[in-house]
């Protein structure tokens, strides 16, 4: 791992009870095509070890969802951010599901060892569990 | 080519005959501005020379389309997945229409040499062949 | 930068007058998580410093956005491209949001030193300049 | 082998409703759309209107008015209503199913045609 | 709408020669990567017949003596060489947009 080739790439576990909207991720081969080399997971959320320029991308399919459903629901917002250390606590992406059931979005972000990203789903709907639906990654790109 | 930075971004080429739903790509300098620089095209389809976990993206948009066109044709789905060899087929990645006409992603997956990848687009759309709507492309990340 | 590491994530900064569709883009540290590490800004344009192969992203939300409103102002869209010189001008990437407030996409792309990239956005509406919405960048690849 | 089969009436009077029926074989209504198209030797082929296989219709401007496309997917039937009707609508009425692709609005398989005359 | 102007109106061409008739957009129906116009010929009581579909593919079962060509606003159908069971009227319709419309025919005599 030495050359920073820190990457990872989650799948939906589950969401968190009623008052937490955060989205719990699991990872390993055993799963399916989900893995980490180099972060970490910290109760389904994703740690990071190596401090530099990540890509970080992600994909979020709401359960048995038509645009309908999505429409009548609306607000649906989910947002990827650093949760922890308290002090660089920052929302990186932000994407509303409006009439759609699919969001998927990917940005560069300077990401620093220790730094936990969370990802909030807020809203009512149920996020599918598909591993080709919902998924979390993030790749080491440059220090 | 040693360092494993295989790539390929792929242009449309056609879709296929009606009981078929994969979409048939074509890279190259002389068509654009796609290429493959270590991946091949087999009958249209990208397959892998190289072991790896990659960054697979994708952008497909439905030709002539409205939002009232998509949702009157719904569902139209896209499909990211290994088609061949059978023994390792599998869905990547999947996005549907709903009341869009354009959708993009992309994940981080493990493939292997030989791994052919199809993109299935299900519904009765034609997708655009602008080369800046509708594109699908894989990067090598690390071993 | 000699190993070819260029990147750049950028926030918006403005847009042009109203003949002018395109975004007006910042980048650096004192402003946020955005920075340049190779590509340079030219009164808001992204400029390239190193040929080869990048990955383009880029998310723009449309400001104080519901579904209604989108489609009340039809049509939006959104395309980056190179600008100049103008001899290699193209359109890269276009995404046009229907009834949806957010575009995101991402595509692999040869880019020269020189090359300025543009993001143009037409409509009537306005973009959002929260940093976690309307982003843009780059990362070199490979030669 | 596909096939459209249209009845409906040849004369109409003045003011009155038009109505015919396609009955489909060969192929299924879930999954492709009908078209509506007449033929009249002042005004050439006209489009009418369409059902897609979702069940959603479209129509030209000019008869949304007093047109109306309906089906019944499991009896593969599709109903045409065409209220008002002068004598400028004597014509061919005709169903035709669009291609596979649902954007492609083009007729790859026609009925056999209605004459309709409008006359008291 | 959009308005599809054929020409000519009427021709006649001998046995194994070449006919063509040309079809006039009042704008353009090239769109993301296609052309959305296609061909069609009725012969006299009977329903048009689908030829040839954005712009330059066959139809399934239509000889291939028939050839389209085209994009932007100018179209050409081209018979060649024409035979005896190719007299009838042509017509050129775009899809564009809705509503699609029908050029007004050129109807083919055959020498």
């Known amino acids: 791992e030495s050359l920073g080739w820190d990457v990872a790439e989650l799948q939906l576990n589950h969401t968190g009870p009623q008052q937490d909207p955060r989205l719990y991720w699991q990872g390993g081969p055993a799963l399916g095509r989900s893995f980490l080399h180099g972060p970490e997971l910290d109760k389904g959320q994703l740690r990071i070890h190596r401090d530099g320029i990540y890509m970080v991308h992600i994909q979020v399919t709401l359960a048995i969802c038509s645009s309908t459903t999505a429409s009548r629901h609306h607000p649906t917002t989910l947002a990827v951010g650093i949760c922890s250390p308290a002090s660089r606590s920052i929302s990186l992406l932000r994407l509303s599901f409006h009439q759609g059931c699919t969001i998927a979005s990917q940005r560069l972000t300077p990401l620093a060892r220790g730094d936990t990203l969370c990802t909030n789903l807020t809203g009512t709907l149920l996020p599918s569990r598909n591993t080709d639906e919902t998924f979390f990654g993030v790749q080491w790109v440059r220090p | 080519e040693s360092l494993g930075w295989d790539v390929a971004e792929l242009q449309l080429n056609h879709t296929g005959p009606q009981q078929d739903p994969r979409l048939y790509w074509q890279g190259g300098p002389a068509l654009g501005r796609s290429f493959l620089h270590g991946p091949e095209l087999d009958k249209g389809q990208l397959r892998i020379h190289r072991d790896g976990i990659y960054m697979v993206h994708i952008q497909v948009t439905l030709a002539i389309c409205s939002s009232t066109t998509a949702s009157r044709h719904h569902p139209t789905t896209l499909a990211v997945g290994i088609c061949s060899p059978a023994s390792r087929s599998i869905s990547l990645l999947r996005l549907s229409f709903h009341q869009g006409c354009t959708i993009a992603s992309q994940r981080l997956t493990p493939l292997a040499r030989g791994d052919t990848l199809c993109t299935n687009l299900t519904g009765t759309l034609l997708p655009s062949r602008n080369t800046d709507e509708t594109f699908f492309g894989v990067q090598w990340v690390r071993p | 930068e000699s190993l070819g590491w260029d990147v750049a994530e950028l926030q918006l900064n403005h847009t042009g007058p109203q003949q002018d569709p395109r975004l007006y883009w910042q980048g650096g540290p004192a402003l946020g998580r955005s920075f340049l590490h190779g590509p340079e800004l030219d009164k808001g344009q992204l400029r390239i410093h190193r040929d080869g192969i990048y990955m383009v992203h880029i998310q723009v939300t449309l400001a104080i956005c519901s579904s209604t409103t989108a489609s009340r102002h039809h049509p939006t869209t959104l395309a980056v491209g190179i600008c100049s010189p103008a001899s290699r001008s193209i359109s890269l990437l276009r995404l046009s949001f229907h009834q949806g407030c957010t575009i995101a996409s991402q595509r692999l792309t040869p880019l020269a030193r020189g090359d300025t990239l543009c993001t143009n956005l037409t409509g009537t509406l306005l973009p959002s300049r929260n940093t976690d919405e309307t982003f843009f960048g780059v990362q070199w690849v490979r030669p | 082998q596909v096939q459209l089969q249209q009845s409906g009436p040849g004369l109409v009077q003045p003011s009155q409703s038009l109505s015919i029926t396609c009955t489909v074989s060969?192929?299924?209504?879930?999954?492709?759309?009908v078209h509506w198209v007449r033929q009249s030797p002042g005004k050439g082929l006209e489009w009418l209107g369409v059902?897609?296989?979702?069940?959603?219709?479209d129509y030209n401007a000019a008869f949304i008015s007093r047109l109306s496309i309906s089906k019944d997917n499991s009896k593969s039937q599709v109903f045409f209503k065409m209220d008002s009707l002068q004598s400028d609508d004597t014509a061919i009425y005709f169903c035709a199913r669009n291609p596979h692709y649902g954007n492609l609005n083009a007729m790859d398989y026609w009925g056999q045609g209605t004459s309709v005359t409008v006359s008291s | 709408d959009i308005v599809l102007t054929q020409s000519p109106a009427s021709l006649a061409v001998s046995l194994g020669q070449r006919a063509t008739i040309s079809c006039r957009a009042s704008?353009?129906?090239?769109?993301?990567?296609?052309?959305?116009m296609h061909w069609y010929q009725q012969k006299p009581g009977q329903a048009p017949k689908l030829l040839i579909y954005l712009a330059s593919n066959l139809e399934s079962g239509v000889p291939a003596r028939f050839s389209g060509s085209g994009s932007g606003t100018d179209f050409t159908l081209n018979i060649h060489p024409v035979e005896e069971e190719d007299a009838a009227t042509y017509y050129c319709q775009h899809s564009r947009e809705l509503p699609p419309t029908f050029g007004g025919g050129t109807k083919l005599e055959i020498k």
């Open positions: 060969g192929f299924s209504l879930t999954t492709y759309a």
């Open positions: 059902i897609w296989s979702t069940g959603i219709t």
């Open positions: 704008k353009s129906v090239s769109a993301s990567g296609y052309t959305w």
